[in-house]
């Protein structure tokens, strides 16, 4: 279930969830469709200061790079 993740524990969780894709500490630019730009929060704010789940962690994974055809 949802839990609080801080420090190295948060990095470990992101590495596990995102794998070789890597991850961002801030949501990628252009993330979401909100017109009114609120101050940007990052994964630290979202998961260390309140409980977060797998879905929220996945939001900070880098996009998959398309594999080149041989």
């Amino acid at each position: 279930g949802p839990e609080t993740l801080c420090g190295a524990e948060l990095v470990d969780a992101l590495q596990f969830v995102c794998g070789p894709r890597g991850f961002y500490f801030n949501k990628p630019t252009g993330y979401g469709s909100s017109i009114r730009r609120a101050p940007q929060t990052g994964i630290v704010d979202e998961c260390c200061f309140r409980s977060c789940d797998l879905r929220r962690l996945e939001m900070y994974c880098a996009p998959l790079k398309p594999t080149k055809a041989a």
Partner: antibody, heavy 119, light 112 residues
């Protein structure tokens, strides 16, 4: 057990830059979140900003244009720079640590260092 | 004006129970962000007293307890002692400010 010690000049002139250092002992700077907090004389606590060793930083919006928090992993230190100071920046400045075992609570604090802004 | 509102002062006699409230909004406490409480004895640095709404760090007596409901939180101190006289601060995260926020602080006076 992590311990923190603030250091820096106790007197800064108006319009100059306040520079403080927090030395970390008993733990690696690469493992935790590090914060600066201040307390003007006779007033409450004000969060200045924090950073994670990865480079993720977050600053108080009211101070953001004047604040920089940086880290020197080789010395196990992190620092605060506050530019264009005025008398309103006179305060006790604390560094603090979120070790991650306390759900984001700042569980280790330095003893604080008093900074006076005056000409 | 603090984002989190605390009463400026509370008082109680030794042995009594006192509570300190911390009122926030839907962008901080009400958004699910944890509330932490700090005790600041005169002339010293703050000390974490309650973390994650209702958890005590090791060494903190069970006379201190925290709770959270909706957009508010509270700290309760039972069996009040003279050395509980201090300033108490609540802290949380605010998504609209994208930063940590403290309450204005509450001065606890132990009477007698």
């Amino acid at each position: 057990q992590v311990q923190l010690q603030e250091s820096g000049p106790g007197l800064v002139k108006p319009s100059e830059t306040l520079s403080l250092t927090c030395t970390v002992s008993g733990g690696s700077i690469s493992s935790y979140y590090w914060s600066w907090i201040r307390q003007p004389p006779g007033k409450g606590l004000e969060w200045i900003g924090y950073f994670f060793y990865s480079g993720y930083t977050n600053y108080n919006p009211s101070l953001k244009s004047r604040v920089t928090i940086s880290v020197d992993t080789s010395k196990n230190q992190f620092s605060l720079k506050l530019s264009s100071v005025t008398a309103a920046d006179t305060a006790v400045y604390y560094c603090a640590c979120i070790t991650g075992t306390t759900k984001g609570g700042m569980d280790v604090w330095g003893q604080g260092t008093t900074v006076t802004v005056s000409s | 004006q603090s984002v989190l509102t605390q009463p400026p002062s509370v008082s109680g006699a030794p042995g009594q129970r006192v509570t300190i409230s911390c009122t926030g909004s839907s962008s901080n406490i009400g958004a699910g962000y944890d509330v932490h409480w700090y005790q600041q004895l005169p002339g010293t640095a703050p000390k974490l007293l309650i973390y994650g709404n209702n958890n005590r760090p090791s060494g903190v007596p069970d006379r201190f307890s925290g709770s959270k409901s909706g957009t508010s939180a509270s700290l309760a101190i039972t069996g009040l002692q003279a050395d509980d006289e201090a300033d108490y601060y609540c802290q949380s995260f605010d998504s609209s400010l994208s930063g940590s926020v403290f309450g204005g602080g509450t001065k606890l006076t132990v009477l007698g």
